[in-house]
Every structure is written in C-alpha cells, then in structure tokens.
C-alpha cells in the first residue's frame, strides 16, 4: 500500500518517499523505485540552507557598497551572506538591505549605548551633576568639576549642557 506520510528528511512523490537534498545541494531528479534522489551542489555564490527539494539554489545576498553595505560574513553553499553597514551607519532593518546614519546625542544628552552596525545610538538626558556640551555619537555625560577638591568654590552653577565654573575662595584680609 503506498505511503501517505514520509519520515523526516523525506518527501512524498508519485506515491513513494524520496530523500530530500541536504543543505547546500539542489534537486536534479526525484527518486524512483530503482534510483535514489539525485542532488547537485549549489554553484558559486549560491546556497540552500535547509533539507529541500528545490530545483534552484538561492543567490547569495549582495552587500551593495552604493548603499553603504559591506560583507560581515561570507556566504557558503549552506548559508547566505550577512551584510552590515560601514562605520558610522547602521542597518535600517533586520534584513540589513540599506543603512542609515548613526544618531548623535545633542548637548544636554550623553551616549547611553554606542551604535553598532545593526542598532542606533541610544541617548540619555544628563542628570543633575552631569553635562554634555557637544553633539556626539560617542561622548557620555561628564560629571561636573568638583571645585572643592581643587580648593576652589563654585562661581557659576553647572547645567546639563555646561560644566560648573570654579573660582578662588574669597580670602579674609
């Protein structure tokens, strides 16, 4: 009696179970009563990443330099190429089809997390006691200068964008 289901890594065709092609290979011809499934390795710049019955391998992803992309990991016959963005840019999506410029943290904000090829800069407001006077994709909030440790006094209070200004203590004559 012909099977209605096949084992793992097999597929049903013409009332019989044939072996699927292994990753990195494509189907050339289905098995018969007398022959095994015929598979062929994927060509250069092609891949198949699952046990399959595909007659064509997939093309490796192209990391288009015109879009700021570069190869992070070269593809094999079993894996696709992984693209990432050039320095200063990050992917616009998980598939990394294009890039976008990293965010800079404005004055009053510091970098909480530096951007990577796949994620944007994360900024945070400088809390009391800290400041940032630059727009930067790297600078954290800096602590206000401690005037006391320099034997000086605060002449001008700090803000989230400016450091305190220290000055000499008034000397009693």
């Amino acid at each position: 009696e012909p099977p209605t289901a096949c084992r793992e890594k097999q597929y049903l065709i013409n009332s019989q179970c044939c072996s699927l092609c292994q990753p990195g290979q494509k189907l050339v011809s289905d098995c018969t009563e007398f022959t095994e499934t015929e598979c062929l390795p994927c060509g250069e710049s092609e891949f198949l990443d699952t046990w399959n019955r595909e007659t064509h391998c997939h093309q490796h992803k192209y990391c288009d330099p015109n879009l700021g992309l570069r190869v992070q990991q070269k593809g094999t016959s079993e894996t696709d190429t992984i693209c990432t963005c050039e320095e200063g840019w990050h992917c616009t999506s998980e598939a990394c089809e294009s890039c976008v410029l990293h965010r800079s943290c404005s004055p009053g904000f510091g970098v909480k997390q530096i951007a990577t090829g796949v994620s944007d800069t994360i900024c945070e407001p400088c809390p009391v006691g800290f400041f940032s006077n630059v727009s930067s994709a790297f600078e954290k909030c800096h602590p206000w200068t401690s005037c006391e440790t320099k034997d000086l006094v605060v002449q001008q209070a700090g803000t989230n964008k400016t450091d305190v200004v220290c000055g000499p203590q008034d000397r009693l004559r």
């Epitope: 616009t92 999506s93 089809e97 294009s98 410029l101 990293h102 800079s104 727009s135």
Partner: antibody
C-alpha cells in the same frame, strides 16, 4: 493619497501655534512623517521627523522650539512655541518611510503659510 | 554633521539645450541622494532617488549620476516647463543630528 496642512495664520511674536497635517487615502502608522518649511524666496529647511514608533528627531537648529506629535493615525501636529519673525514661512508636511531610502519624500502637502509679525 | 552644497545658485539655458546642476556632500553618503523640482506656489516634486533612479512619470531627459561625494543632475532638451528650482537631498539621515538634509537650491531659467 494626499496630505493637507492646516492652522497657518498671522500671529504675533511669542504666540504659540499648532499646525496639523491630515492624511487622506492612507494611515500614517507605517510611515515617517516630516515637517519642512520654506521662508519666502528661500530654500527648503527640514524641521524634524516623527517615526512610526512616535519617536521624533529634529534639525540641530530647532533647540526645542518645535514639537512634532502624532495625534491620530491620520494626523501629525507641529507645535511652534514662541515663534519669531524668522519663522515666517510656508510649512510643508511630507511622507517618507521607503524601506531603503528612509527619508525620501514621495508625497507632500500643498503647504500652509505662517506669518509672524507684530 | 552632513552638509549638502549645491552649485550654481542659478543657471540658464536655451530651449533644446542642456543644463547641469551639482550637489556636493561634506562626507560619504553613498547613493543616498534625491533630487526634487519645485515650481512657484507648489510643493517639491520627486525626480530622482538613489542618485540615479528616475521617479515614476519623470521624462528621461532628466539624468542623475554620482561620483564619490559629488552628485550631478543633468537636464537635456530643455523645455519651458523645466523652469523651476531644483534641490538635492540626503535621504538617509535617520535620527542623526543634522542641520538640514537639503542643498540650497538651484534656479533653472529657460530662455
């Protein structure tokens, strides 16, 4: 699909003003929406953009004077706090959000004129 | 901060002639550049994206190219309807702290 800006009028310096951009034929949920202005006889000046997750980014010259917010799936507001005569311009709303060219503006409103004068 | 510098501020050409507009990016923006056409009293209209991809409905008399950080818009077989101001725009600034993604504009006068 279209966009229309409203709320432009003559205001005195320092009077807060809110402009509204209304979408027809689509919802703004999956798009980045931007405000761009143009002073009389001058070039285009980007003000800011609101993402589909409602986070906004602004031009470095804005300094907190403008606030963009999504008020519904079809409206985006631009609030101008303390306008000066320098803010006299036609204000355009533009739709971006193509997957590859993320800030490409393929749909614009006709613009609304804001005049700041005492 | 990426800055887009457009030249010239104004250019004129005869009907049937050719004009060229340039846009220089202050750093590498790859092919993330668009060109727009704006006529008085109207919003800008998208002409090109990706430096050289023609937007739908735009005649092939318009062409765009890139060489490093310099981008060029060429209008050939000039028509009276081409009289307008043209702007370049950096299209992938995302949430970066940019002053403006637009160039200053170039007015095209058709004689």
């Amino acid at each position: 699909q279209s966009l229309e800006e409203s709320g432009g009028r003559l205001v005195t310096p320092g009077t807060p003003l809110t402009l509204t951009c209304t979408a027809s034929g689509f919802t703004m949920n999956r798009y980045r929406m931007s405000w761009v202005r143009q002073a009389p006889g001058k070039g285009l000046e980007w003000i800011g953009t609101i993402n589909n997750d409602a986070g906004a980014s602004y031009a470095s010259w804005v300094n907190g004077r403008f606030t963009i917010s999504k008020t519904s799936s079809t409206t985006v507001d631009l609030k101008i706090t303390g306008p000066t005569t320098e803010d006299t311009a036609t204000y355009f709303c533009a739709r971006a959000g193509d997957n590859i060219y993320v800030d490409l503006y393929n749909l614009w409103g006709p613009g609304t004129l804001v005049t700041v004068s005492s | 901060d990426v800055v887009m510098t457009q030249t010239p501020a104004s250019v004129s050409g005869a009907v049937g002639g050719t004009v060229t507009i340039k846009c220089q990016a202050s750093e590498n923006i790859f092919s993330y550049l668009a060109w727009y056409q704006q006529k008085p009293g109207q919003p800008p209209k998208l002409l090109f994206y990706g430096a050289s991809n023609l937007a739908s409905g735009v005649p092939s008399r318009f062409s765009g190219s890139r060489s490093g950080t310099e981008f060029t818009l060429t209008i050939s077989d000039l028509e009276c309807a081409d009289a307008a101001t043209y702007y370049c725009q950096f299209t992938n600034y995302g949430s970066s702290d940019i002053r403006s993604p637009f160039g200053g504009g170039t007015e095209v006068v058709v004689k």
